[in-house]
């Protein structure tokens, strides 16, 4: 039994890091393998992650981590019974994929303005809380070509757009994702989308 593709890990910089790897043949990851991980720090304890299958030869493990900060570094040991298959390390702050924003809401009752709001996925004492920027994707259910991205580079988790920039009388969907420049993160997954019917009064022609 050998590792074909070494584990690669990403962290949500809060409580979970996800590691994926591939074996050289079909493997029952949960019964045959264990991923041991330990913070390189005074008094830290070793933890065991039981991997799940991710395709025939692929495995995935969700590592639970407390109080993740930029100085943290973890040792990783992949075991098959008594055999050490792979040894490595992982620094969560260097491989961050933020959590997806939540609670995306479209407020249509503001005069001819659409207000989109969502929730920051991190608590205020997490470093990423004040460093997330967002991309909002709005698209028409009727017209695949009517697809737009708004970059929200300020900290406020909201976006105002004039209803008139979208077509009236049709349904739209929106979703939002996040990233943080400070840690050179990847983009988060998209939030669940929300749907609304866009209608506004055309201005009277003089």
């Amino acid at each position: 039994m050998k590792v074909l593709q070494e584990p690669t890990c990403v962290s949500d910089y809060m409580s979970i890091s996800t590691c994926e790897w591939k074996m050289n043949g079909p493997t029952n990851c949960s019964t045959e393998l264990r991923l041991l991980y330990q913070l390189v720090f005074l008094l830290s304890e070793a933890h065991t992650c039981i991997p799940e299958n991710n395709g025939g030869a692929g495995c995935v493990c969700h590592l639970l981590m407390d109080d993740v900060v930029s100085a943290d570094n973890y040792t990783l040991d992949l075991w098959a019974g008594q055999q050490l298959l792979w040894k490595g390390s992982f620094k969560p702050s260097e491989h961050v994929k933020p959590r997806a924003p939540g609670n995306l809401t479209v407020h249509t009752n503001v005069s001819d303005t659409l207000l989109l709001t969502w929730s920051n996925p991190y608590p205020p004492d997490n470093y990423l809380y004040n460093h997330l920027t967002y991309a909002v994707n709005i698209w028409s259910e009727n017209d695949p070509a009517d697809f737009r991205i708004y970059n929200v580079t300020y900290l406020e988790p909201s976006l105002r757009i004039a209803a008139s920039t979208l077509k009236s009388g049709i349904s739209y969907r929106a979703r939002v994702r996040a990233w943080a420049q400070c840690y050179n993160t990847t983009w988060s997954e998209w939030s669940p989308s929300t749907k609304w019917h866009n209608s506004y009064r055309e201005p009277f022609e003089q």
């Epitope: 720090f41 830290s44 407390d66 109080d67 900060v69 930029s70 100085a71 943290d72």
Partner: antibody, heavy 116, light 111 residues
């Protein structure tokens, strides 16, 4: 929000022991390390030791080895620091502080006065 | 005994900029992250800077940190009277054993 509430001021005689408590609230108690540091009057900060509330393991500064004991009670989310064989040089404000490499949350401090 | 050296005192007028240095060695600052703490009179220390140059939520951007080799610097711009306090640097030392250490402390006076 995170709060670390320490016990009140103590006056002790030389040779006695003191036990200072630090009650945590507003977060998952076992998920964060707790340090103890002290500050003598007009002096700087001095690290005493650390406890991992999850398993209760400890590490102490060499200077305090054999005199300090740190414990925790997970049922009340409280950590304790006991210092024995007190001498006048132990007169200081004792702080608990939450964190690993740096300490974002501190207790208000407990003044321990050692005087005959 | 602290192995991080800071100037005992610095002073400047309101609105000015001041810097506080913290000098260590290869077994501490040279090999670890630096944090800075502000201690107002009669209160507990407060985290100002961590990870060499990051500010916790609620700390104004007048405060900044940097690190080069075995020394670190805290800079405060637009000085206010409320900034008058003691400032401590902190890091981890690996010799002879892993442990946190603090600087000797610097008293900032706003003239």
């Amino acid at each position: 929000q995170v709060q670390l509430v320490q016990s009140g001021a103590e006056v002790k005689k030389p040779g006695a022991s003191v036990k200072v408590s630090c009650k945590a609230s507003g977060y998952a108690f076992t998920s964060y390390y707790m340090h103890w540091a002290r500050q003598a009057p007009g002096q700087g900060l001095e690290w005493m030791g650390i406890i991992n509330p999850s398993g209760g393991s400890t590490s102490y500064a060499q200077k305090f080895q054999g005199r300090v004991t740190m414990t925790r009670d997970t049922s009340t989310s409280t950590v304790y620091m006991e210092l024995s064989s007190l001498r006048s040089e132990d007169t200081a404000v004792y702080y608990c502080a939450r964190g690993k490499w740096w300490w974002q949350h501190w207790g208000k401090g407990t003044l321990v006065t050692v005087s005959s | 005994q602290s192995v991080l050296t800071q100037p005992p005192s610095v002073s400047a007028a309101p609105g000015q900029k001041v810097t506080i240095s913290c000098s260590g060695g290869s077994s501490n600052i040279g090999n670890s992250y630096v944090s800075w703490y502000q201690q107002l009179p009669g209160t507990a220390p407060k985290l100002l800077i961590y990870d060499n140059n990051k500010r916790p939520s609620g700390i104004p951007d007048r405060f900044s940190g940097s690190k080069s080799g075995t020394s670190a610097t805290l800079a405060i711009t637009g000085l206010q009277t409320g900034d008058e306090a003691d400032y401590y640097c902190g890091t981890w030392d690996t010799s002879p054993v892993d442990r946190p250490i603090f600087g000797t402390g610097t008293k900032l006076t706003v003239l």
